[in-house]
C-alpha cells in the first residue's frame, strides 16, 4: 500500500481467482483513543472499532471510502483504491492501446518546436467517474523540472458503437535548452482513477523524436509566363523554432490530381519555394520536417491548381 | 578553417559534409524511430557516448560570441564517433553488408574533424578509454545505439554550420 | 537484492591450483560483468581478471599465464582458478560487479571475500 | 598500465574536522568526448569489502552521506571528507577504470587525531 495523495491510498493486488489479497491497517487520523467506529462508503454498518481498522483487501468490494466517526462526527476519511496485478503485467484497462508507433502505446506525444514544450493525449472509451493527474521530468535517477497543466477533454469521437474520449495535457520543460543534443529522455507519467481502480501509464521520449511541425503557411501559386509551370512558395510556421538558419526544415511538394489514383509528382527542396506543373483539377500540398533529423514530417498545406 | 588560434572554419564546407552526415546517418540505420532504445537499458550507452550540452556554446548566441568552445567540442565528438565507427563493433562479426553507408560515414566523420583541425593544428590529445571486448550478439544493439546516438549528435553539429555558413561566414 | 559470494577451500599448498567460486543473485549476467580482486593481508588491492558478459575474458599481464576465469550461467556461478601458487598469492580474493556498457566500469557491488592461504 | 599513486599514505584528522586525500594517475583519465573522468574512490573498513563512494570522478554513489565528495580531473583527483565522523576511519582507495588492467592506488589509512 502507498499513499497516492492526501487520504489517498493504492492497494497493489495480485488478481486472480482465491487471491489471498493484502491486510492493510488504517489509522484515524485523530488524537482520540476510544470510541471510535468505522464504516465504509455510504453504508452505516460499522466496520470495527478502535484507532486502527485492519481489512483483507481483495476485490473491489473492499475498496473505497473508509470513515472513522466518534459520536455521530467524522474524524477522518481513508479512500483505497486497488491497482491489479495480472500475471505479473500491471492492468491497463482505463486507456485504449492506440497502437501507434507500436503495440501498448497508451500515451503519444508531440512537440512542434525544440523550446521543451509538448502535448501528450490519450484514448479511453470510459466517460464518467474518472480523473486524470499528469507528472514528468527529464531523467528518472536525477530528475529536472517539467511543468504540466491539468488533463482535459479534448476531442469526442463516435467509433462504431462506442463513444472515444481524448483526453490531453501540455507540458513545458522548466529550463529547457532548445540548442542542445539531449541526453536524458523526458519521461511522463499519467495516473488514472477510474471509479476505484487505479493505473499508471508512462511514456518516455527525447523532445527530437516527437518533432512534429506545423504546416507550412502563406502557402502561394504564381503562375510562370507562357508555361504550365507555376512557382509555389510557402514560409516556416509560426510555432517553428527561431533562427531559421540554425533550426532548418525541409519540404516536400506535391501535386495530386483529383483522383487518388492518378499518379502524384513529388519535389524535396530545403528552399521555400519550388517550380511544378499544375494540371488542371490538381491541388498542390507542402509539408515539412525538420532538416537534419528525421522526425515526424507535418500535416500537408494545400492549395488548389485553378 | 577552424585553428586553435580562433580563425573561422570553412562553414559553407563544413555545413555541406555535415549534412552529407545526417544523411549517412540515417540511411545507416533508417528504422530506427520505431524502435524504443530504452526498452534495452539504453542510460548505459547514452551515458558513454558525447553530447553537445547546454553549456557548449553551440547555441545562435554561443556561436556569436565564440564558436571556437562549441567547434572543439563537435571535433572531439567528431573523433570519438570516428573510433567507435572504426572498433570491432563496426569491424567485427556479424559482417556489415557491402554496401552498407557505415563506411562513407566513418570517412566523412573523419573528413569534417579534419576540415576543423587541418594537419599541424592540435586542441588537444584526443583519448578515449578501451572499448569493452563485444561479441557478436552484443555488437548489432550496440551499433544500433551508437547510431542512434550519432543521428543526433550530427543534427546539432548541422545546425551550428549551417547557422554559421548563414550568419558568420566572411 | 544484488548479492556476490565467494566459496572455497581456504588453504592451498604451494605449486597446486587454486579455485574459487563466486555465486551470485540479484541481477542479470547479460548486464554484468563480473571481476576477480585480490588483497595480501595488509596491503593493497590488486585486480586479477574479468570475464565479460559475452563470456570473454582479461587478465591482469603480472597473472595471465596462470590465471582462468570461467562462467556457468546455468548456475549463476563464476570460477578462478590460479595454478602453480606460492606464499605471494596468500590473500583475500574477492569478486565484484561493473555494469557493461562501451566502456570498462567501475566496481559497484562486491562479495564479502575469501582468504585463502598458500601454505604447506 | 597506469600507475595509480595516492597520498598521503596515511591522515589523521580531528573530528568535525575536514580530510582531504589525493590520488594521481601516470596518464590522464578523462575522455574527451564524453568529458567523464573514469575513477572512482572506495572506502575499506577492517574484515570488510570496499565499498564504493564515488564514481567518475564526482558522483556520489547513492547512500554515501554527502560529507563525501569527488573532484578534479585528467590527472588530478581528489577525495573530501567535509567534517569527520568516527566511523569514516577506514583505507581509502582510488581505481581508474580507463583502460585496462584496473589499477588501484596504494591505500590511504585515515584515522582520528
Known amino acids: 500500500i502507498w499513499e497516492l495523495k492526501k487520504d489517498v491510498y493504492v492497494v497493489e493486488l495480485d488478481w486472480y481467482p482465491d487471491a489471498p489479497g493484502e491486510m492493510v491497517v488504517l489509522t484515524c487520523d485523530t488524537p482520540e483513543e476510544d470510541g471510535i467506529t468505522w464504516t465504509l462508503d455510504q453504508s452505516s454498518e460499522v466496520l470495527g472499532s478502535g484507532k486502527t481498522l485492519t481489512i483483507q483487501v481483495k476485490e473491489f468490494g473492499d475498496a473505497g471510502q473508509y470513515t472513522c466517526h466518534k459520536g455521530g462526527e467524522v474524524l477522518s476519511h481513508s479512500l483505497l483504491l486497488l491497482h491489479k496485478k495480472e500475471d505479473g503485467i500491471w492492468s491497463t484497462d482505463i486507456l485504449k492501446d492506440q497502437k501507434e508507433p507500436k503495440n501498448k502505446t497508451f500515451l503519444r506525444c508531440e512537440a512542434k518546436n525544440y523550446s521543451g514544450r509538448f502535448t501528450c493525449w490519450w484514448l479511453t472509451t470510459i466517460s464518467t467517474d474518472l480523473t486524470f493527474s499528469v507528472k514528468s521530468s527529464r531523467g528518472s535517477s536525477d530528475p529536472q523540472g517539467v511543468t504540466c497543466g491539468a488533463a482535459t477533454l479534448s476531442a469526442e469521437r463516435v467509433r462504431g458503437d462506442n463513444k472515444e474520449y481524448e483526453y490531453s495535457v501540455e507540458c513545458q520543460e522548466d529550463s529547457a535548452c532548445p540548442a542542445a543534443e539531449e541526453s536524458l529522455p523526458i519521461e511522463v507519467m499519467v495516473d488514472a482513477v477510474h471509479k476505484l481502480k487505479y493505473e499508471n501509464y508512462t511514456s518516455s521520449f527525447f523532445i527530437r523524436d516527437i518533432i512534429k511541425p506545423d504546416p507550412p503557411k502563406n502557402l502561394q501559386l504564381k503562375p510562370l509566363k507562357n508555361s504550365r509551370q507555376v512557382e509555389v512558395s510557402w514560409e516556416y510556421p509560426d510555432t517553428w523554432s527561431t533562427p531559421h538558419s540554425y533550426f532548418s526544415l525541409t519540404f516536400c511538394v506535391q501535386v495530386q490530381g483529383k483522383s487518388k489514383r492518378e499518379k502524384k509528382d513529388r519535389v524535396f527542396t530545403d528552399k521555400t519555394s519550388a517550380t511544378v506543373i499544375c494540371r488542371k483539377n490538381a491541388s498542390i500540398s507542402v509539408r515539412a520536417q525538420d532538416r537534419y533529423y528525421s522526425s515526424s514530417w507535418s500535416e500537408w498545406a494545400s492549395v488548389p491548381c485553378s | 578553417r577552424a585553428v586553435p588560434g580562433g580563425s573561422s572554419p570553412a562553414w559553407t564546407q563544413c555545413q555541406q559534409l555535415s549534412q552529407k552526415l545526417c544523411t549517412l546517418a540515417w540511411s545507416a540505420h533508417p528504422l530506427v524511430g520505431h524502435m524504443d532504445l530504452r526498452e534495452e537499458g539504453d542510460e548505459e550507452t547514452t551515458n558513454d557516448v558525447p553530447h553537445i550540452q547546454c553549456g557548449d556554446g553551440c547555441d545562435p548566441q554561443g556561436l556569436r560570441d565564440n564558436s571556437q568552445f562549441c567547434l572543439q567540442r563537435i571535433h572531439q565528438g567528431l573523433i570519438f564517433y570516428e573510433k567507435l565507427l572504426g572498433s570491432d563493433i563496426f569491424t567485427g562479426e556479424p559482417s556489415l553488408l557491402p554496401d552498407s553507408p557505415v563506411g562513407q560515414l566513418h570517412a566523412s566523420l573523419l573528413g569534417l574533424s579534419q576540415l576543423l583541425q587541418p594537419e599541424g593544428h592540435h586542441w588537444e590529445t584526443q583519448q578515449i578509454p578501451s572499448l569493452s571486448p563485444s561479441q557478436p550478439w552484443q555488437r548489432l544493439l550496440l551499433r544500433f545505439k551508437i547510431l542512434r546516438s550519432l543521428q543526433a549528435f550530427v543534427a546539432v553539429a548541422a545546425r551550428v554550420f549551417a547557422h554559421g555558413a548563414a550568419t558568420l561566414s566572411p | 537484492q544484488v548479492q556476490l559470494q565467494e566459496s572455497g577451500p581456504g588453504l592451498v599448498k604451494p605449486s597446486e591450483t587454486l579455485s574459487l567460486t563466486c555465486t551470485v543473485s540479484?541481477?542479470?549476467?547479460?548486464?554484468?560483468?563480473v571481476h576477480w580482486i585480490r588483497q595480501p593481508p595488509g596491503k593493497g588491492l590488486e585486480w586479477i581478471g574479468v570475464?565479460?558478459?559475452?563470456?570473454?575474458?582479461d587478465y591482469n599481464p603480472s597473472l595471465k599465464s596462470r590465471v582462468t576465469i570461467s562462467v556457468d550461467t546455468s548456475k549463476n556461478q563464476f570460477s578462478l582458478k590460479l595454478s602453480s601458487v606460492t606464499a605471494a598469492d596468500t590473500a583475500v580474493y574477492y569478486c565484484?560487479?561493473?555494469?557493461?556498457?562501451?566502456?570498462?566500469?567501475?566496481?559497484?557491488?562486491w562479495g564479502q571475500g575469501t582468504l585463502v592461504t598458500v601454505s604447506s | 598500465d597506469i600507475v595509480m599513486t595516492q597520498s598521503p599514505d596515511s591522515l589523521a584528522v580531528s573530528l568535525g574536522e575536514r580530510a582531504t586525500i589525493n590520488c594521481k594517475p601516470s596518464?590522464?583519465?578523462?575522455?574527451?568526448?564524453?568529458?567523464?573522468?573514469?575513477l572512482a574512490w572506495y572506502q575499506q573498513k577492517p574484515g570488510q569489502p570496499p565499498k564504493l563512494l564515488i564514481y567518475?570522478?564526482?558522483t556520489r554513489q547513492s547512500g554515501v552521506p554527502d560529507r563525501f565528495s569527488g573532484s578534479g580531473s585528467g590527472t588530478d583527483f581528489t577525495l573530501t571528507i567535509s567534517s569527520l565522523q568516527a566511523e569514516d576511519v577506514a583505507v581509502y582507495y582510488c581505481?581508474?577504470?580507463?583502460?585496462?588492467?584496473?589499477?588501484f592506488g596504494q591505500g590511504t589509512k585515515l584515522e582520528i587525531k
Open positions: 565484484a560487479r561493473d555494469k557493461y556498457g562501451l566502456f570498462p566500469g567501475y566496481f559497484d557491488y
Open positions: 581505481l581508474q577504470h580507463f583502460n585496462y588492467p584496473w589499477t
Open positions: 570475464i565479460w558478459t559475452g563470456g570473454s575474458t
Open positions: 596518464q590522464s583519465l578523462l575522455s574527451s568526448g564524453n568529458r567523464k573522468n573514469y
Open positions: 567518475y570522478a564526482s
Open positions: 540479484g541481477f542479470s549476467l547479460i548486464s554484468y560483468n
